[in-house]
């Protein structure tokens, strides 16, 4: 039968520079001599010769004269080979084919990498800076290998995901330099943090830059927003409340707002310099520009999803800057529930039957309540179970097994937490007359 | 080493248009903003306008608003001024200038001179 | 558009001679004020910004104060290299504005 070669499963991991082994066994018969083993190393998919070593002799290196044999273990089966200043060039398959009177072959994997450099940070501009303005942040890493990951992030940990442009560019040795661009506009001060990431390695090389602009000594502006969520029914228009004071003999060229998502920080409107700059929001929001010169700073938010929940930041500069957040909460009403009974006929007290309510399109989660027709709470063998949509939007379904009695109603309420609405549905049976002792 | 240099001087015909590059290097040119400032022999400065490359966002000084056209080329880093309908009081040193407050670094300029 | 005045419009004056130019605005412009120093055939050169703050590279005679409407330019002890013309600049509004310009001469 054919010779057992063994190699590692997994890729043999090497540093660019290092020498690397990569391992290969096979099992000597007993007067084993090495006169008789023809082994050869080659490249598993060019067929190109590594190393050899045939007639009991080590034929030596044709790889660059970077390879070696273990000559003391061959005799025991150790057909290893070493790869001395790996490059990222050898990466690949590299087979292991060994002949005595069978022979055998088997193949394993060289995986090459380099670490990442720490990141270097430059901000352009990186004076006179104010709220509003937008900054480029540039994160460059050097000499890695394979390609980085590159996450963005804030103070907070929160991942920025927005204008973010990566280029890698491999040298001629065939390592990667990575430069990572931010594009974020400032607000009153922000820590932004770059992770370069070697995903072979798991290697994190990471840095950051704090940022505070420029202060006036006049003081802050002081904005205002409610405190309670802004609740807003999907596919309806909500408007989220920002106001200022403006000061005597105050235009509307020296205001600087921007309306963004407290988390990502993604531009969600601005206006700067007088000018209304737009929705970068899905073309859904407009200021009120009539009303700004009086200090309203406030967001119309247009045919509201589910998608748009969570906080805006409503950010005012003028000499100084302010700013506040606002929660959108949003909410779709449950329909009247559908009920389903199974089995539905030929029903007998002491039949169990199952009772299916069914509400659809709503939102937040809802909670579900049985009850019998006396309002008894009924919770023992309920199962309810909500799927969201594409939407977000959820349909509940919601499941009560329950031993008929004589007859009975059941309620199912569908309470949407959120706008305090209850959609119920309820179901009747009559069992058939009661014949003693109960039929089999 | 951040440079701004721009193009040659040009004599142009009343009426016509000019049009003026200026060729960033040594930073990041969708960073900053570009401003265009003129100076007519012996005057002040006149600020034109600027262009936010990154995205070509103008803003334009009234008084040239109708004849001014700012642009960028981003794959070369370069911006460009064409003022039209020209007249001999456009005479003057035009400057490209990066920065949205302050303008940090300045081309060479380029002369324009307007004569029948 | 806010007008922006310069004074005086000329001057002369000797090597180590202190020297103070002042600008003027029509509105409040807080402290967005910056100075630029140009040499004939040359393009300005910023010096000030932010009212106060010195550019990078710019000896520290030169010094600027002021916030609102009144502002100053102050050369501690003038040197050769600093006979020029000064122009101040607004960053308040939109458009940009300078001053007439005031040109240092030497006695």
């Known amino acids: 039968g054919a010779l057992e070669v063994q190699v590692p499963e997994d890729p043999v991991v090497a540093l660019v520079g290092t020498d690397a082994t990569l391992c290969c066994s096979f099992s000597p018969e007993p007067g084993f001599s090495l006169a008789q083993l023809n082994l050869i190393w080659q490249l598993t998919d060019t067929k190109q010769l590594v190393h050899s070593f045939a007639e009991g002799q080590d034929q030596g290196s044709a790889y660059a004269n970077r390879t070696a044999l273990f000559p003391d273990l061959l005799a025991q089966g150790n057909a290893s080979l070493r790869l001395q200043r790996v490059r990222v060039a050898d990466e690949g398959s590299f087979t292991c084919f060994v002949s005595i009177r069978d022979f055998g072959s088997a193949a394993v994997s060289l995986q090459v990498a380099a670490p990442y450099s720490k990141p270097s940070m430059t901000l352009e501009p990186n004076k006179d800076l104010r709220p509003g303005d937008t900054v480029t942040i540039t994160c460059s890493s050097y000499q890695g290998y394979p390609e980085a990951e590159v996450f963005w992030q804030d103070g907070q940990g929160v991942p920025l995901t927005g204008n973010v442009t990566t280029s890698q560019m491999a040298n001629e040795q065939g390592l990667f330099d990575v430069h990572s661009i931010l594009r974020v506009v400032l607000g009153a001060n922000g820590t932004y943090s770059c992770l370069v990431r070697n995903p072979v390695l798991q290697q994190d090389a990471h840095s950051s830059v704090t940022i505070t602009p420029q202060r006036s000594p006049t003081g802050a502006v002081e904005v205002q927003v409610p405190e309670d969520p802004v609740v807003a029914l999907v596919g309806t228009d909500a408007t989220l409340r920002c106001s200022f004071s403006p000061e005597p003999g105050f235009s509307l060229a020296q205001l600087n707002l921007i309306w963004q998502l407290t988390d990502t920080k993604q531009l969600v409107h601005s206006f700067t310099e007088g000018r209304d700059q737009g929705s970068a929001y899905a073309n859904r929001t407009a200021l009120f520009p009539d009303l700004l010169a009086q200090g309203n700073a406030s967001l119309r938010l247009q045919r509201v999803r589910v998608a748009d929940e969570g906080s805006f930041t409503c950010f005012v500069s003028i000499r100084d800057f302010g700013s506040a957040a606002v929660s959108l909460q949003v909410a779709a009403p449950y329909s009247k529930p559908s009920m389903t009974l199974e089995p539905n006929k030929d029903l007998r007290p002491g039949d169990t039957v199952t009772i299916t309510c069914s509400s659809y399109r709503g939102y937040p989660e809802a909670e579900v309540f049985w009850q019998d027709g006396q309002g008894v709470p009924l919770t023992g063998n309920v199962t309810t179970s909500q799927m969201a949509n594409e939407q977000g939007l959820f349909d509940v379904h919601s499941v009560l097994r329950v031993v008929l009695g004589a007859n009975g109603t059941y309620s199912c309420l569908v309470r949407n937490p959120v706008l305090q609405q209850d959609a119920h549905g309820s179901v009747t049976i009559t069992g058939q007359p009661m014949t003693f002792p109960p039929e089999a | 080493e951040v440079q701004l240099v721009q193009s040659g001087a040009e004599v142009k015909k009343p009426g016509s248009s000019v049009k003026v590059s200026c060729k960033a290097s040594g930073y990041t040119f969708t960073a900053y903003w570009m401003n265009w400032v003129r100076q007519a022999p012996g005057q002040g400065l006149e600020w034109i306008g600027r262009i936010e490359p990154y995205d070509s966002e103008t803003r334009y000084n009234q008084n040239f608003r109708d004849r001014a056209t700012l642009t960028v080329d981003k794959s070369t880093s370069t911006a460009y001024m064409e003022l039209s309908s020209l007249r001999s009081e456009d005479t003057a040193v035009y400057y490209c200038a990066r920065g949205v407050r302050i303008f940090d670094y300045w081309g060479q300029g380029t002369t324009v001179t307007v004569s029948s | 558009d806010i007008q922006m005045t310069q004074s005086p419009s000329s001057l002369s004056a000797s090597v180590g001679d202190r020297v103070t130019i002042r600008c003027r605005t029509s509105e409040n412009i807080d402290y967005t004020l910056a100075w630029y120093q140009q040499k004939p055939g040359k393009s300005p050169k910023l010096l000030i910004y932010?009212?106060?703050t010195l550019e990078e590279g710019v000896p520290s005679r030169f010094r600027g104060s002021g916030s609102g409407t009144d502002f100053t330019l102050t050369i501690s002890s003038l040197q050769p290299e600093d006979f020029a013309t000064y122009f101040c600049k607004q960053a308040y509004d939109v458009p940009r504005t300078f001053g007439g310009g005031t040109k240092v001469e030497i006695k």
């Open positions: 932010n009212a106060n």
